[in-house]
Each structure stands twice: as C-alpha cells, then as structure tokens.
C-alpha cells in the first residue's frame, strides 16, 4: 500500500512539476526591466525565451517574437535547449510512468516490468528536473552578470545617432516558476525511484539440500512443517521423505510406513 501511495504521489508531483516547466518555458517574464531608477516610466520591457514584450502604464501590452536564431546570445539558446530537453524527457517519463502505476493493470504485466518502468520514469523525471533547474539558473546567472556589467555606449551614423540604453533587467516570474517546477519534478523522480525498490519482487530462490539422518534416509524440506494453526496448505504437518539426496525441485512425496505424527 505504501509503495502504491509513494508511486502515485511521485507521479502527481512530477506531473505538476512538468506542467510548471512547460508554463515557465512559455512565459514571457523571464527578465523584466529593472525600474529601480525609473519607477514612474510610462513604458517598460520584459522578455522571455521566445519573444520580447512592452507594457505601458495603462496596461496595454504588445509582444513580438525574436527575428532570428543567429542574432541571439548563445546562453539564451542553451537555456532554450535545456528547457526543451527537460520537457521532452518529462513527457516521456510521464508516459512511461502511467503504464508503470501499480493501480493500473495492463494485460499480464509482471511486477518486475512495472518496477523497471517506474525506475526508468523516475530517472527521466530527475534528469528533467535537473535540466529545468540548470536552464533557469544559467539564465539567472546571465541576468546577474549583465546587471552589474551593463554600460551605455553611443555610436553615430547617417547624420543621426543611436545610443545603447543602460537598461538593467531583473528576475522575472518565470524564473521562480521554473525553479519550483524543476524541484517538484526532481522530488517526484526520487519518489518514483524509491517506489521502484518496493515494487521489485524479492527473488530468493533457495535450493533445499538433502541431509542424511542416521537410521532413515530423510530429505528435509524447508516448510515441511507448516504452521500448526491450520492456515497453511500443509495442514496435516507432513514430513517429506525420500531415499536419495535431491534438490527441492526433485522431491516427491510417497505414501510410506514412516508417515507419522
């Protein structure tokens, strides 16, 4: 019961986590214009992995997708890749874990197969969570670096002048969503891995060795005496004898003059 609960909870936590990773990846507020020096600005900018948005004090917002792949910073591309890998792994993990759930019966799937699938999905969730956390952390590090390194520069051309504005960007809501979602996916993955240990059947195959007792040829079968309470299948408390030294698999029970007790 505890294993099913752990597995089920792991699945739900991972599901929430992956939904959060998808939400964070799609959100526009990865970085927001720092308004510390200009709190009454009419217009401010916030940017995501895929597009840039401007919002004015009236609430009117306009977003435009980035034009090109080539003109974007390598770090941004890396963050995009990490988040997409996280989503893909998480989605595959969810698909695998649905079939691995103990509460769902699919044909004659053995517990060992379910255990392997649970472990596989757990590992996928862990990697997915780590990808999301890494992606968000790389982006956050980029923001912090740019925040302290930002400089204004100017260049002229064609009679006019273009000035690069010293705009500082700070952490957007998507970063916090990403961190929490990545953490949840990671926790869900760990729970699935823990559940896997409980699902795996304990295969302890004992080969019963025959012992030769003095006076009689006795092959002692472990479990020959089943509980005297009468709950076992061997309610007559039979002992099993055989003349030869055989393994448990070979032992046969013959009616004999030595049947007693």
């Amino acid at each position: 019961m505890a294993v099913t609960a752990c597995q089920g909870l792991g699945f739900v936590v991972s599901l929430i986590g992956i939904a959060g990773i998808i939400a964070a990846t799609c959100m526009d507020q990865w970085s927001t214009q720092d308004l510390y020096n200009n709190p009454v600005t009419a217009v401010f900018n916030y940017q995501g992995l895929w597009r840039s948005c401007v919002r004015e004090s009236s609430g009117f917002t306009e977003c435009r997708g980035y034009f090109t792949l080539l003109g974007l910073p390598a770090m941004l591309q890396a963050v995009r890749a990490l988040m997409i890998v996280g989503i893909v792994l998480g989605a595959i993990g969810l698909l695998v874990s649905i079939f691995a759930l103990k509460c769902i019966r699919i044909g004659s799937m053995e517990d060992s197969a379910k255990a392997n699938m649970t472990l596989t999905s757990g590992i996928m969730f862990i990697v997915s969570g780590l990808c999301a956390i890494a992606g968000v952390s790389v982006f956050a590090n980029m923001l912090v670096t740019n925040f302290w390194m930002s400089t204004a520069n100017m260049y002229t051309g064609m009679g006019g002048m273009v000035q690069t504005v010293q705009t500082r960007y700070t952490f957007g809501a998507a970063l916090f969503v990403g961190w929490v979602a990545g953490g949840l996916t990671l926790i869900g993955g760990v729970m699935m891995c823990i559940a896997c240990r409980g699902l795996a059947p304990e295969e302890t195959n004992y080969k019963a060795v025959s012992y030769h007792a003095s006076g009689h040829s006795v092959a002692y079968k472990p479990g020959g005496f089943k509980a005297s309470t009468g709950f076992g299948s061997n309610t007559k408390n039979k002992k099993i004898y055989d003349g030869g030294a055989r393994t448990e698999d070979e032992v046969q029970s013959y009616p004999s003059k030595h049947d007693y007790v």
């Epitope: 940017q47 306009e62 003109g71 910073p73 740019n146 273009v162 504005v165 705009t167």
Partner: nanobody, 120 residues
Framework: QVQLVESGGGLVQPGGSLRLSCAAS????????TGWYRQAPGKQRDLVAT???????NYADSVKGRFTISRDKSKNTAYLQMDNLKPEDTAVYFC??????????????WDAGTQVTVSS
C-alpha cells in the same frame, strides 16, 4: 542597426501649420516610444511631444492644444502636426525612437534634426 528618417521641416509664417514625420527602420523588435525634442539657438534641448506604442501621448505645456502627435504602427512612423505656429517655435526638431532591437538590447535612436523656422 536602427535608422530614423525625418521630413517636413521648413519655413512657415506665424499662425501657419507644418507636419513632421519620422520613420524608423532597421531590425526593430518593439518600438516603445517615439517623439520630438527641439533645440532653439543657444538653448538646451527640450521635450516637445512623445507617443508610446500603445498610443499614450505626452506634450510640453508650451505646445498643448497646438501640436498633435500620432503614429502609424504598421509603418513604424510618427507624425507631429504643428498648428498655430509661433515665432518661439523656431528651432531644430529632433525625432527620437526608444526601441528594443533584440534580447536585452534597448536603444534610443536620434535623427540629425530638421529646421523649423516661423517668421513673417
């Protein structure tokens, strides 16, 4: 690279009208605000009017009721309609655009300016 092309300046009599236009071109992602500053001889540059991407306008007190700023979003162009011009409106008018050109790349572009002279 962002470029601004301004047109419409010239000589006009007091009480007359002029229309300035300012077209922004280049790899512009978001055009945040567009507007005009002016600089009279021997004076500092003053704000005339601004318009945000959403259409919110702002005017200097000296031009309120006489000047109207508008924009054509599809052409990334702003217009300054100047009516009932006075001799004190004589100045070099500079168009500017505050733009986002890429990821965490915000720039303010200025044009070279156009002369507006109000004289009889």
């Amino acid at each position: 690279q962002v470029q601004l092309v301004e047109s419409g300046g010239g000589l006009v009599q007091p009480g007359g009208s002029l229309r300035l236009s300012c077209a922004a071109s280049g790899s512009i992602l978001n055009l945040m605000t567009t507007g005009w500053y002016r600089q009279a001889p021997g004076k500092q540059r003053d704000l005339v009017a601004t318009i945000t991407f959403g259409g919110t306008t702002n005017y200097a007190d000296s031009v309120k009721g006489r000047f109207t700023i508008s924009r054509d979003k599809s052409k990334n162009t702003a217009y300054l309609q100047m009516d009932n011009l006075k001799p004190e409106d004589t100045a070099v008018y500079f168009c500017y655009a505050d733009v986002i050109v890429g990821f965490q790349d915000r720039r303010v572009a200025w044009d070279a300016g156009t002369q507006v002279t109000v004289s009889s």
